[in-house]
């Protein structure tokens, strides 16, 4: 006979997993807030900027009470994937003006990627149904001008900030229900 079976693998405490996800999200939120402020200092925004390709905000703060964990994580992952794609696009096609936001924009991209991997891990640890593979997204058109890239940056960082703020609140609320 082979060696005796080892002890059963204990799945990590989902609350601890959720905690580390909250910490990553909160850290990314602070980074985004600071980078958005840096952008406003360098290129003051003339009003609010929108980008049609960005996801709409997942939830108003008032509607947080009705949230369920699978829905929150699936939606958050989808939205953050979209923001990751937009940050990558911004770094690639945003123009020379936005080079002044490096290396911070690169750090933001890396941390966003890390948070997405953490969310994926959390979903598997919680045995939540894995979302289907993302359909290939249509390529984002390059900004029409340097100012177009700056406007896009305002929209992306502003939207990401709101999304992460919603995410921190939602995840903390969900933690109390685990």
């Amino acid at each position: 006979p082979g060696p005796p079976p080892g002890p059963p693998r204990v799945s990590p405490d989902p609350r601890a997993e959720l905690d580390s996800t909250v910490l990553l999200t909160r850290s990314l939120l602070a980074d985004t807030r600071q980078l958005a402020a840096q952008l406003r200092d360098k290129f003051p925004a003339d009003g609010d900027h929108n980008l049609d390709s960005l996801p709409t905000l997942a939830m108003s703060a008032g509607a947080l009470g009705a949230l369920q964990l699978p829905g929150v994580l699936t939606r958050l992952r989808a939205d953050l994937l979209s923001y990751l794609r937009h940050v990558q696009w911004l770094r690639r096609a945003g123009g020379s003006s936005l080079k002044t936001l490096e290396p911070e924009l690169g750090t933001l991209q890396a941390r966003l990627d890390r948070l997405l991997r953490r969310l994926q891990l959390l979903m598997s640890r919680l045995a939540l149904p894995q979302p289907p593979p993302d359909p290939p997204a249509p390529p984002l058109a390059p900004p029409s001008s340097a100012w177009g890239g700056i406007r896009a940056a305002h929209a992306i960082l502003g939207g990401l900030h709101l999304t992460l703020d919603w995410a921190v609140r939602g995840l903390l609320l969900l933690k109390t229900r685990l």
Partner: antibody, heavy 120, light 108 residues
């Protein structure tokens, strides 16, 4: 050597106004975010307001929002706090403070403070 | 807002003893956003420890910080007479930035 020197404190009646100044030297003022922090007599520290290097992002504590205005003049290496509709509970020593080298490293440099007394 | 609660409110120790000051945070915060300050009577606060465990410039090695999540600690390994003061923790991850109410370290 980094130096921050506050001025403009004094005695003011409730409902009155006061403008505090903070003169900065020994560093490139236009490169750093700046804060005002206050301390009521015998009490702890309370953060009041923050302004980014280019003045385009400003945050306030809820207790002063709508009454206080933080501003800066990078050409004069100066930070300001305009305080309107003053209340007795605004009585405190007001400090200006500079962030360390990054925004997430705490308030590394402080002035000596200026006392604001709101009383009739 | 994020609330920081320091304990004990007052700590009475003798020079040479070890001091352990606690800061409990109402929400989980990343450790890079937790800082400690020292304030002596009639003086401005002084940054002691930033990002939970990094000593600020000129701070002696007897001061150290640790912690994560919601529980953070400032330790003074062997108290010197000049260490008796009030100590504050502060978070910088969320606006409004907030301080703990302080721990007064006094000579026994």
């Amino acid at each position: 050597e980094v130096q921050l020197v506050e001025s403009g404190g004094g005695l003011v009646q409730p409902g009155g106004s006061l403008r505090l100044s903070c003169a900065a030297s020994g560093f490139t003022f236009s490169s750093f975010g700046m804060h005002w922090v206050r301390q009521a007599p015998g009490k702890g520290l309370e953060w009041v307001a923050y302004i980014t290097p280019g003045s385009n992002t400003i945050y306030y504590a809820d207790t002063v929002k709508g009454r206080f205005t933080i501003s800066r003049d990078n050409a004069k290496n100066s930070l300001y706090l305009q305080m309107n509709s003053l209340r007795a509970e605004d009585t405190a020593v007001y400090y200006c403070a500079r962030e360390y080298y990054s925004y997430d490293e705490g308030f590394a440099y402080w002035g000596q403070g200026t006392l604001v007394t709101v009383s009739s | 807002e994020i609330v920081l609660t320091q304990s004990p409110a007052t700590l009475s120790l003798s020079p040479g003893e070890r001091a352990t000051l606690s800061c409990s945070v109402s929400d989980l915060i990343p450790s890079q956003y937790l800082h400690w300050y020292q304030q002596k009577p009639g003086q401005a606060p002084r940054l002691l420890i930033y990002r939970t465990s990094n000593r600020a410039s000129g701070i002696p090695a007897r001061f150290s910080g640790s912690g994560s999540g919601t529980d953070f600690t400032l330790t003074i390994s062997s108290l010197e007479p000049e260490d008796f003061a009030v100590y504050y923790c502060q978070q910088g991850v969320d606006v409004p930035f907030t301080f703990g109410q302080g721990t007064k370290l006094e000579i026994k």
